[in-house]
């Protein structure tokens, strides 16, 4: 059992990674002198309590930011945010936040990350670029909710 | 206004099954965990488990089971205690509480006001 | 199966300080345990107070607070009122369960 956060680094078909801009994502072309953030994740220690065949139930933070990712609902509208937040903290808890917890499946070298709490509702990002990351249920051409999931040693 | 409604009083034989419920309102239970607490006259509380009503996974203490099932509705709000193969000792106040996520921690914060269970021949 | 103990009973005053413990037998208690403490009052009336050790649920006055003091898991209230006068429970995680405590009867007189 891995109990210490994972790094990786994520960047979606386009070639887009992911930039904390105003304690907001967003996805933008890599360019020299830019500093794409290192996620953190780790998967729930409660998994037994989750359903088994959506992906793989992980805490999502921000590397060395003490930073997450969560879902929350503005109005009728599911939403992504991040909250201040030590993913062990999360991690650690009696039950998994769902907020908090989000499904990764990966299939070849593509990973999608679907809510726990809004099943349906994906990690996107639009496909002009340069926008907030959002949360989809729409897998279709105006966003795009596959990306690459490199995992740092 | 978020409320746990119970079923009411229940007597029944030994031997015999029973099913309580507990009704939500002002929130979806499929949102949050439920948990079931009992409480023996002049006892402590007893966890007996606690069920996520969003995919029907349930934890249930070592104790329980075997004597105790836990259910959720989501299309009624409701979630369900069912006891079985009952005795004088399951002679009991039994609760429904939320257990909810709130900033830092899991709180218990609302609860139902209690069936009282009465075994006896 | 882990059992949790708790004092009995205890008494207060107005605007006195009183805390009430709770103690594991299987050791010291520890954040890992998450510490709940729940308030029940006449009539079935639950009110959950703590969580997570010590961290105040939504709409609880700020006299209750929770700590670990020692081995055990503590309940302060500070300043009590004679609305306070109840049951406390904890509760304590270990791994995948939960053990309520017996209760400590709290009257301020």
């Known amino acids: 059992k891995i109990d210490t956060p994972q790094r990786g680094s994520i960047q979606d078909i386009n070639h887009r990674v992911w930039v904390l801009q105003d304690q907001t994502l967003i996805a933008v072309p890599r360019k020299d002198r830019m500093s794409p953030v290192t996620i953190a994740l780790i998967s729930c220690r409660h998994v037994e309590t989750l359903e088994k065949d959506r992906g793989n139930p992980i805490y999502l933070g921000l590397n060395g930011l003490n930073l997450c990712l969560m879902c929350a609902k503005v109005g009728d509208q599911p939403t992504l945010q991040l909250k201040e937040k030590d993913i062990m903290d999360l991690y650690n808890q009696p039950e998994p936040v769902k907020s908090f917890l989000f499904y990764h499946s990966q299939s070849g070298r593509n990973s999608t990350f679907e809510s726990v709490a809004f099943p349906g509702w994906f990690i996107a990002v639009s496909s002009e670029g340069g926008c907030p990351l959002i949360l989809t249920q729409e897998l279709g051409k105006a966003n795009t909710t596959d990306f690459g999931l490199t995992m740092l040693f | 206004e978020v409320q746990l409604q119970q079923s009411g009083a229940e007597l029944v034989k030994p031997g015999a099954s029973v099913k309580l419920s507990c009704t939500a309102s002002?929130?979806?239970?499929?949102?949050?965990?439920i948990y079931w607490v009992k409480q023996r006259p002049e006892q402590g509380l007893e966890w007996i488990g606690r069920?996520?009503?969003?995919?029907?996974?349930?934890r249930y203490d070592p104790k329980f089971q075997g004597k105790a099932t836990m259910t959720a509705d989501t299309s009624s709000n409701t979630a369900y205690l069912q006891l079985s193969s009952l005795t004088s000792e399951d002679t009991a106040v039994y609760y429904c509480?939320?257990?909810?996520?709130?900033?830092?921690?899991?709180?218990?914060?609302?609860w139902g006001q209690g069936t009282t269970l009465t075994v006896s021949s | 199966q882990a059992v949790v103990t708790q004092e009995s009973a205890l008494t207060t005053s107005p605007g006195e300080t009183v805390t009430l413990t709770c103690r594991s037998s299987?050791?010291?208690?520890?954040?890992?345990?998450?510490a709940n403490w729940v308030q029940e009052k006449p009539d079935h009336l639950f009110t959950g107070l703590i969580g997570?050790?010590?961290n105040r649920a939504p709409g609880v006055p700020a006299r209750f607070s929770g700590s670990l003091i020692g081995d055990k898991a503590a309940l302060t209230i500070t300043g009590a009122q004679t609305e306070d006068e109840a049951i406390y429970f904890c509760?304590?995680?270990?791994?995948?369960?939960?053990?309520f405590g017996g209760g400590t009867k709290l009257t301020v007189l």
């Open positions: 997570g050790t010590n």
């Open positions: 299987t050791g010291a208690v520890t954040t890992s345990n998450y």
């Open positions: 069920i996520d009503p969003a995919n029907g996974y349930t």
């Open positions: 509760a304590l995680w270990y791994s995948n369960h939960l053990v």
């Open positions: 002002g929130f979806n239970i499929k949102d949050t965990y």
């Open positions: 509480a939320r257990y909810e996520y709130y900033d830092s921690s899991f709180y218990f914060d609302y």
